[in-house]
Interface confidence: low
């Protein structure tokens, strides 16, 4: 929908992945003096918000609490400014934030090929493995906003596993990754045991885009 | 100040189905988050569900998932709520309520219908 | 989901007496979003306090609300011969919104 406004911006602190019981401040600001904020949650459970907005040095914002955390609460999240009450005039929606429960299942095993040690310039693929069969392994650096995500391949000598080629080292990294099924998107297993990948040689700093490989899948945005 | 009137006592069979209306005034109906709640004879208070009718996605309680419907018609300011595969244990009276703007959750609920009684028997 | 339970079940007072009802939360209850509600028999429920401790519009200041995380409490300060009726908590911070299963203020 258009909206009368132009789109505020949607935060989550201190990260869209959230621990199970933990709670995440999805902060919705603009520097269009919005009276009032609403935080649509789309997902298995649809839900919508109101805050009353704050006004500081041309900005405003609402923090929207949300937790403590649980599978209901995991979904695509977009908020709308209003500058009057009665009736709404709903703003733009801000671009879509997935939030997503972590913590639900066992962790994951995160290995280096040819290890975690590489030279730069040097391939290093990561891979992501488990017994339980999930369907969907994603990688996360730490300092990045986005995860990798790729499909598990079938079961190989009991486990399930995914590879992330990296290509070509340049940065090192603390690099976690998840396990998730396929009919619950926004509901992922424990971390695995972070894996701090060096590199020894010139650094730069780039590490693939999640949108890049072939092989990937999109982010999800609606179960509906 | 808000209103929400809501439709007259049902007498309704075990199996069947049935549509309670819950109509507003006095606002803006489309930003209303209408919640609806049932209370048994002599017990608590229960949420079924809710809706906002701009979004237009009704929110279920997980007790109720897949025997209630809830939807709302912005042309006459009404939300309705529908309880299917009727059993005696259904027999309570159920209360729309809303807080007078967007939430489920988040707002109390500041304003009620004055009640339904459905009663369920052969 | 949060469970509330509310105690006592039934509490036989005199009017002009003071009124203590506890409400107790399975978990924290999210920024204190806890309301108390009064209903009478044959009465749709009506918003006494929100927020833990704001009184709605209109209600009598006999009635407080305090309270925090999974501890809260409604009093009322003097008894009227109106008050006797059933009083409910409520959590809306988190989804499922839940009701306690009330407490029944009656004439001694």
């Known amino acids: 929908h258009e909206g009368v406004h132009r789109k505020p911006s949607l935060l989550a602190h201190p990260g869209r992945l959230v621990k199970s019981e933990e709670t995440v401040i999805l902060q919705c600001w603009s520097d269009v003096r919005f009276e009032h904020f609403l935080l649509h949650r789309e997902g298995k459970f649809k839900d919508t918000l109101h805050l009353i907005g704050e006004h500081h040095d041309g900005v405003s914002k609402a923090n929207f609490s949300i937790g403590p955390m649980m599978q209901d609460l995991a979904g695509t999240y977009r908020c709308y400014g209003s500058v009057t009450h009665s009736p709404y005039q709903l703003s733009a929606p801000s671009d879509p934030l997935d939030i997503v429960i972590t913590g639900l299942y066992e962790k994951p095993s995160l290995s280096a090929q040819p290890g975690p040690t590489v030279l730069a310039g040097e391939s290093v693929t990561l891979s992501c493995s488990s017994r339980s069969s999930y369907d969907m392994y994603h990688l996360s650096r730490e300092g990045e906003a986005h995860e990798c995500r790729f499909s598990a391949g079938p079961k190989v000598n009991g486990t399930f596993q995914a590879d992330f080629p990296l290509g070509p080292a340049t940065h090192g990294g603390t690099y976690r990754c998840f396990g998730s099924f396929r009919d619950s998107p926004y509901e992922w297993s424990n971390s695995s045991d972070p894996l701090l990948v060096s590199v020894t040689g010139n650094p730069s700093n780039s590490w693939p885009s999640p949108t890049e490989p072939s092989s990937k899948t999109g982010n999800p945005r609606h179960l509906h | 100040e808000v209103q929400l009137v809501q439709s007259g006592a049902e007498v309704k069979k075990p199996g069947s189905s049935v549509k309670v209306s819950c109509k507003a005034s006095?606002?803006?109906?489309?930003?209303?988050?209408i919640s609806w709640v049932r209370q048994a004879p002599g017990q608590g208070l229960e949420l079924m569900g809710g809706?906002?009718?701009?979004?237009?996605?009704?929110n279920y309680a997980q007790k109720f998932q897949g025997r209630v419907t809830i939807t709302a018609d912005e042309s006459t300011s009404t939300a309705y709520m529908e309880l299917s595969s009727l059993r005696s244990e259904d027999t309570a009276v159920y209360y729309c309520?809303?807080?007078?703007?967007?939430?489920?959750?988040?707002?109390?609920?500041?304003?009620w219908g004055q009640g339904t009684l459905v009663t369920v028997s052969s | 989901e949060i469970v509330l339970t509310q105690s006592p079940g039934t509490l036989s007072l005199s009017p002009g007496q003071r009124a203590t009802l506890s409400c107790r939360a399975s978990?924290?209850?999210?920024?204190?979003?806890l309301a108390w509600y009064q209903q009478k028999p044959g009465q749709a429920p009506r918003l006494l306090i929100y927020?833990?401790?704001g009184r709605a519009t209109g209600i009598p200041d006999r009635f407080s609300g305090s309270g925090s995380g999974t501890d809260f409490t409604l009093t009322i300060s003097r008894l009227e011969p109106e008050d006797f009726a059933v009083y409910y908590c409520?959590?809306?911070?988190?989804?499922?919104?839940?009701f306690g299963g009330g407490t029944k203020v009656d004439i001694k």
């Open positions: 309520a809303t807080s007078g703007g967007y939430s489920y959750f988040l707002s109390p609920l500041d304003y």
């Open positions: 006095g606002g803006t109906f489309s930003s209303y988050a």
């Open positions: 809706i906002i009718p701009i979004f237009g996605t009704a």
């Open positions: 978990q924290s209850v999210s920024s204190n979003y």
């Open positions: 927020g833990a401790s």
């Open positions: 409520q959590q809306y911070g988190s989804s499922p919104l839940t």
